[in-house]
């Protein structure tokens, strides 16, 4: 005897994702990155906001800073001095650009349980950090650098020429922060804190972007940012080093720029300390296909820094730009002169090389038709790196160990078989001497963070396994995901397809293409996400596809550099090619195909809609670039050269969205932008809108007042609700 109706079958209790789930962040995950303070100790902020010290060897944990102390100054962040005497507490966080922010800092003395009084830090501070040894402090206030030997001491002022929007000391200007370093700081302590290196950026001749910030005053404020657009005057950079023990003795000493770099416009790209008296600087020509790595030594007799030509290593690309998105950084070995670095091999794949004397004599450490992505750590006997080698899926990341102490070197994949179904995309965080490390797995299953022994690779414990998320997802009908490839005209197009839960190949579904497509990007990755497109598949029954076409990363230089000097052509072609292939699969309703993207993706989606193919019914561009003449010099010129007649002006002009205004006539276009976008200026969308109006083409638009490139806060909810309505209307889906 069985009941005639089953009330609690799995199907009945399962529900689709809702837009509310996404906007509320109901299914967000946690990761656990230990804040390492020694070979076997790390700090972590507990759920109740205590700062806890963990000792892996003993299994013991200790609260070193109570939530009460944190709360007393409304601290949102902290930093322990290396001598463990003091903690800085950070509060009044105020965001500036992508990485930069200002804050108020309080110093707490752990030995007496009191805040340091006297010679308090000024506010707001732009950047602050401890020396690597002891408890010296370096900080940037009003674009100048200051040094304290101890937190309670009066400060020593290192620079005096700092001026808002003119001279930046120890912090980058807008373009260096976003496109070159990319960090909020531009100062670097030597390993034992003897020296402090810093960059000075002179923006006096850079044209200024100005936009209104409406706020709620009677008159809007004007935001002014020195922002070099393609072809404009760039910042002038200088690097100085000061002895922090006797800072007044000789003062800051400038590090010389290699002659072959200094002969024309150039960039500084990174600084790596090797020892307390050896430093490595990387420079780049403005035409970014030549990079120079320069190793400099301290001359005790002259108290200067010497950078002999014999210690200059040149990296040049003949088929594109130097490096991937950025020129890679060296990881020095224990001899303090040789180093490991990722750059293209003779077959055009980015691999680890060992450089002992010259780049020409570099020893290739990894090889194959895949790419090494990051070098995490080099110890006396091991090198840890990540790559996408395993099973030939470019969108995966596994961690490998190469034994460099033995010959021939042996390679071991540390992560490939750990949790094979759940985890195919890893990063790692190593303690001192790689005694222990944390693995953070981002998917494709629910993310998990684990702690491992650096010698044996044994898992010691789970740091975070997102149990609550796992339980919350038990009654959710998640979409299915597939990662596959299309082979088209000798090009491999990897794609990720997100399919509705009850997907049936014999039915027809609306298709949404989500595109980014920028140079050296990757969208098709084996990572976990429950986001807007998950909802569109789960609840609204759409198929969503992401395609990595020409110009994307980690599949070799042929694909990567295909877009060199020709942005806006192949990226768009490859999205269109993929759509045609998806239609051939038989389950796409070819009358209901849309495309959307943000930033570079907004540029590509706009060009795809205006391609005249008739493939797309509608599309959305959020904060798109519309002309490369409007975007930042460092980024744009890397891929496009200069907008001059004798260089690449013609393609700059040909690749604008405005030039295709007429072609938007037969598509539904939704254009969206924040008015306070410091990155891709509102100007871009204003020009698209003007061109469409002038061409008498109907379109929809939404601006977000005082919002930047991220459209965060309440704007996010409004944005995704608005885009959902637009797509449902386009696909004739009932509300």
């Amino acid at each position: 005897l069985r009941p005639s109706r089953v009330h609690n079958s799995e199907e009945n209790t399962m529900r689709a994702l809702t837009l509310k789930d996404i906007l509320n962040g109901t299914f967000s995950y946690k990761t656990f990155f230990p804040n390492w303070i020694s070979g076997q100790e790390y700090l972590h902020q507990s759920a109740d906001n205590n700062i806890v010290l963990y000792n892996i060897e003993t299994g013991q944990s200790y609260t070193i800073l109570s939530n009460r102390t944190m709360k007393s100054v409304n601290a949102s962040n902290y930093g322990l001095s290396p001598d463990r005497q003091f903690v800085y507490l950070e509060s009044d966080y105020s965001k500036l650009w992508r990485y930069s922010y200002t804050a108020t800092y309080y110093i707490y003395d752990l030995s007496n349980g009191e805040f340091v009084r006297g010679n308090e830090l000024p506010r707001p501070i732009q950047y602050l950090c401890w020396s690597p040894v002891g408890s010296k402090l370096a900080y940037v206030y009003q674009n100048n650098i200051y040094l304290k030997q101890r937190p309670g001491d009066p400060p020593f002022q290192i620079t005096f020429n700092g001026r808002e929007n003119k001279i930046f000391n120890g912090i980058p200007d807008w373009v260096y922060e976003e496109e070159m370093l990319p960090t909020k700081y531009a100062l670097w302590w030597s390993p034992n804190g003897k020296f402090l290196a810093y960059a000075e950026f002179n923006d006096k001749d850079i044209p200024v972007i100005a936009y209104s910030y409406y706020g709620d005053e009677q008159y809007p404020r004007t935001i002014n940012i020195p922002y070099p657009k393609a072809g404009a005057k760039n910042p002038v950079v200088r690097i100085f080093i000061i002895d922090t023990t006797y800072p007044a003795y000789v003062g800051p000493q400038e590090v010389p720029v290699p002659a072959m770099i200094a002969s024309s416009d150039y960039y500084f790209s990174w600084l790596t300390w090797v020892t307390d008296e050896r430093v490595c600087l990387q420079w780049l020509k403005r035409v970014q296909n030549v990079s120079v790595l320069s190793i400099c030594d301290f001359r005790e007799d002259w108290q200067t820094w010497d950078c002999p030509k014999t210690q200059e290593h040149i990296e040049e690309s003949r088929t594109g730009w130097a490096g991937g998105f950025f020129v890679s950084r060296p990881v020095f070995s224990y001899d303090a002169i040789s180093y490991y670095k990722i750059f293209s091999d003779k077959d055009g794949y980015k691999h680890i090389h060992y450089i002992k004397d010259t780049v020409e004599n570099a020893i290739q450490i990894t090889s194959g038709k895949w790419e090494a992505i990051n070098i995490f750590r080099v110890t006396q006997d091991s090198l840890f790196y990540s790559s996408n080698e395993f099973e030939e899926y470019p969108g995966r990341r596994n961690i490998y160990r190469i034994s460099i102490g033995s010959y021939p070197p042996s390679k071991k994949c540390v992560t490939c078989h750990l949790r094979k179904e759940r985890c195919q995309y890893y990063t790692a965080s190593f303690s001192d001497y790689a005694k222990y490390y944390a693995l953070v797995c981002y998917g494709p299953g629910i993310p998990i963070s684990t702690l491992h022994d650096g010698r044996t690779d044994q898992e010691i414990k789970i740091l975070e396994e997102n149990k609550e998320l796992e339980n919350a997802l038990k009654n959710i009908q998640l979409p299915k995901e597939e990662i596959k490839k299309l082979e088209v005209d000798e090009i491999t197009l990897w794609y990720k397809m997100i399919l509705p839960p009850q997907f049936d190949r014999s039915k027809k579904y609306p298709l949404l293409i989500q595109v980014y497509g920028g140079p050296c990007s990757q969208s098709v990755r084996s990572v976990f996400a429950v986001n807007w497109i998950s909802y569109l598949a789960s609840k609204e029954g759409m198929v969503i596809a992401l395609v990595d076409g020409r110009g994307t990363a980690f599949q070799g230089d042929k694909l990567l550099y295909a877009v060199y000097r020709k942005l806006g052509v192949y990226e768009v072609e490859d999205q269109i090619t993929a759509v045609r292939k998806f239609i051939e699969m038989g389950f796409i309703d070819e009358k209901r195909i849309a495309i959307w993207g943000w930033s570079y993706g907004g540029y590509v989606s706009s060009l795809a809609l205006a391609s005249g193919t008739g493939l797309f019914k509608c599309g959305i561009a959020v904060a798109p670039v519309s002309s490369w003449e409007y975007y930042a010099s460092v980024y744009t010129e890397r891929f496009m050269g200069l907008p001059t007649k004798d260089d690449n002006l013609e393609h700059y002009k040909n690749s604008t969205v405005m030039a295709r205004a007429e072609y938007f006539r037969n598509v539904d276009y939704l254009l969206i932008h924040g008015t306070a976008d410091d990155n891709v200026h509102f100007q871009n969308s204003a020009q698209i809108a003007k061109a469409l109006v002038n061409a008498q083409v109907d379109f929809q638009a939404m601006w977000y007042s005082d919002q930047n490139h991220g459209l965060s806060g309440l704007s996010t909810n409004h944005l995704y609700t608005h885009m959902t309505h637009f797509l449902k209307q386009c696909f004739s889906l009932s509300d």
Epitope: L53, L80, N112, G113
Partner: nanobody
């Protein structure tokens, strides 16, 4: 240089208490951070409690609320009051000293050690 000598260990029943003392030689005792470590058979030596020169204390989570560390600079002595003892607290308890911060949990960071005093907790 500082010499350390522990006392006060012994055999005690579960839930019982002991007060361990560590006498230090040297006139600069007040400038040292002092710590109590313990080592159970077959286990590594672990920091149980520490007190900075300024009097700030901290404890391993496993003993928090049960053990109290204190110092008497006039007597050059540091104390560990152990209450609500459990069989897993059985170990040799060592007194240790270091200049600078007390917030170090690795034995290698503590240069000065006593000989140790045995604490046995029976069930």
């Amino acid at each position: 240089q500082v010499q350390l000598q522990e006392s006060g260990g012994g055999l005690v029943e579960a839930e019982g208490s002991l007060r361990l003392s560590c006498a230090a030689s040297g006139r600069t005792f007040g400038s040292y951070a002092m710590g109590w470590f313990r080592q159970a058979p077959g286990k590594s030596r672990e920091l149980v409690a520490a007190i900075s020169s300024g009097g700030t204390t901290y404890y391993a989570d496993s003993v928090k609320g049960r053990f109290t560390i204190s110092r008497d600079n006039a007597r050059n002595t540091v104390y560990l009051q152990t209450n609500s003892l459990k069989p897993e607290d059985t170990a040799v308890y060592y007194c240790a000293a270091r200049t600078g911060s007390a917030y170090y949990t690795n034995r290698i960071d503590w240069p000065y050690w006593g000989q140790g005093t045995q604490v046995t907790v029976s069930s």
